[in-house]
Interface confidence: medium
């Protein structure tokens, strides 16, 4: 998709729905394309992200993608459909309310990949296993 | 399809409290961010406060007017967005509209009315 | 907070009119702007979000335009049941704040 300063008009009547039934409606996402990060080493990281979006199509949820090599970390941020792949993977955790990071196998880089479709998710980028959790006590600790 | 249905509402003397819900239905609640909306007798819309996922920590915003005496809440298991009210004043009389926030769906309103 | 001012606040046009309302932030929203319709007795209705991407749903003789301090909602051929009050609100900041409202009347 694109962020709101370059959108063009779009009225699709179709109602998006999820495999509950319940109505997909636009997300909220962080949108800042790739940004330099200083997110490295760390059980979870914020994007820093000022740029939260109403994503252009229901069926689109939130993505990051963290990238290192040589010379930098980057993250990007963006809406995404999860039918299309992104960066040629397929969104396998676009259902997760949490953005939980996955590495990729890329040549000549460390890749990490997380979608999820709760608002602002990929605001929060998790990389550790052990966050992966339903303890709301837990989650209160991480994300405060 | 996508329902929200505010209640709790009515009469109650200036410095009283109110409890507002919101009942959601038709889409995955705890995925959303939610917000109140409010609107006095004859004048335009004005933003209330929201609450974020309890994903990302429930966090609450609130504009200023209302700031330390209303509070938002969210029970996901119950798919209901509350709005605690409290030192009511004249001025907080007003319909009372549960949104999905920034997007579509509003509720249809429920009316507050501090006057003694 | 950032002020959304719009203009007029009120007109009264006839039916097939082609209607425009503009609306001003008092600081650069990119944007980050909403337009909402509303009738007496009932919620508003989102009509554009994102300055200028239609809501699904809305007629396409609704647009909207601008970008940083500056908006436009435009109705191209006033219909019957467009009579109403219209809103501007910016969500580029915390707390998003709406504009005056704009009420099209009956000519």
């Known amino acids: 998709t694109i962020p709101p300063h370059v959108q063009k008009s779009v009225n699709n009547d179709m109602i998006v729905t999820d495999n509950n039934g319940a109505v997909k409606f636009p997300q909220l996402c962080k949108f800042c394309d790739v940004r330099f990060s200083t997110c490295d080493n760390q059980k979870s990281c914020m994007s820093n992200c000022s740029i939260t979006s109403i994503c252009e199509k229901p069926q689109e949820v939130c993505v990051a993608v963290w990238r290192k090599n040589d010379e930098n970390i980057t993250l990007e941020t963006v809406c995404h459909d999860p039918k299309l792949p992104y960066h040629d993977f397929i969104l396998e955790d676009a259902a997760s309310p949490k953005c939980i990071m996955k590495e990729k196998k890329k040549p000549g880089e460390t890749f990490f990949m997380c979608s999820c479709s709760s608002d602002e998710c990929n605001d929060n980028i998790i990389f550790s296993e052990e966050y992966n959790t339903s303890n709301p006590d837990l989650l209160l600790v991480i994300f405060q | 399809q996508v329902q929200l249905v505010e209640s709790g509402g009515g009469l109650v003397e200036p410095g009283g409290s109110l409890r507002l819900s919101c009942a959601a239905s038709?889409?995955?609640?705890?995925?959303?961010?939610m917000s109140w909306v409010r609107q006095a007798p004859g004048k335009g819309l004005e933003w209330v406060g929201r609450?974020?996922?309890?994903?990302?920590?429930?966090?609450?915003e609130f504009a200023a007017p209302v700031k330390g005496r209303f509070t938002i809440s969210r029970d996901d298991s119950k798919n209901t967005l509350y709005l605690q009210m409290n030192s009511l004043k004249t001025e907080d009389t007003a319909v009372y509209y549960c949104?999905?926030?920034?997007?579509?769906?509003w509720g249809q309103g429920t009316l507050v009315t501090v006057s003694s | 907070d950032i002020q959304m001012t719009q203009s007029p606040s009120s007109l009264s046009a006839s039916v097939g009119d082609r209607v425009t309302i503009t609306c001003r932030a008092s600081?650069?929203?990119?944007?980050?702007l909403n337009w909402y319709q509303q009738k007496p007795g009932k919620a508003p209705k989102l009509l554009i979000y994102?300055?200028?991407s239609l809501q699904s749903g809305v007629p396409s003789r609704f647009s909207g335009s601008g970008s940083g301090t500056d908006f436009t909602l435009t109705i191209s051929s006033l219909q019957p049941e467009d009579f109403a009050t219209y809103y501007c609100?910016?969500?580029?900041?915390?707390?998003?704040?709406f504009g005056q409202g704009t009420k099209v009347e009956i000519k």
């Open positions: 609450i974020k996922t309890t994903y990302s920590g429930g966090a609450t």
């Open positions: 994102a300055a200028s």
């Open positions: 949104t999905l926030d920034l997007r579509k769906y």
């Open positions: 038709g889409f995955t609640f705890s995925n959303a961010w």
């Open positions: 600081q650069s929203i990119s944007s980050y």
């Open positions: 609100q910016q969500s580029y900041s915390t707390p998003p704040t």
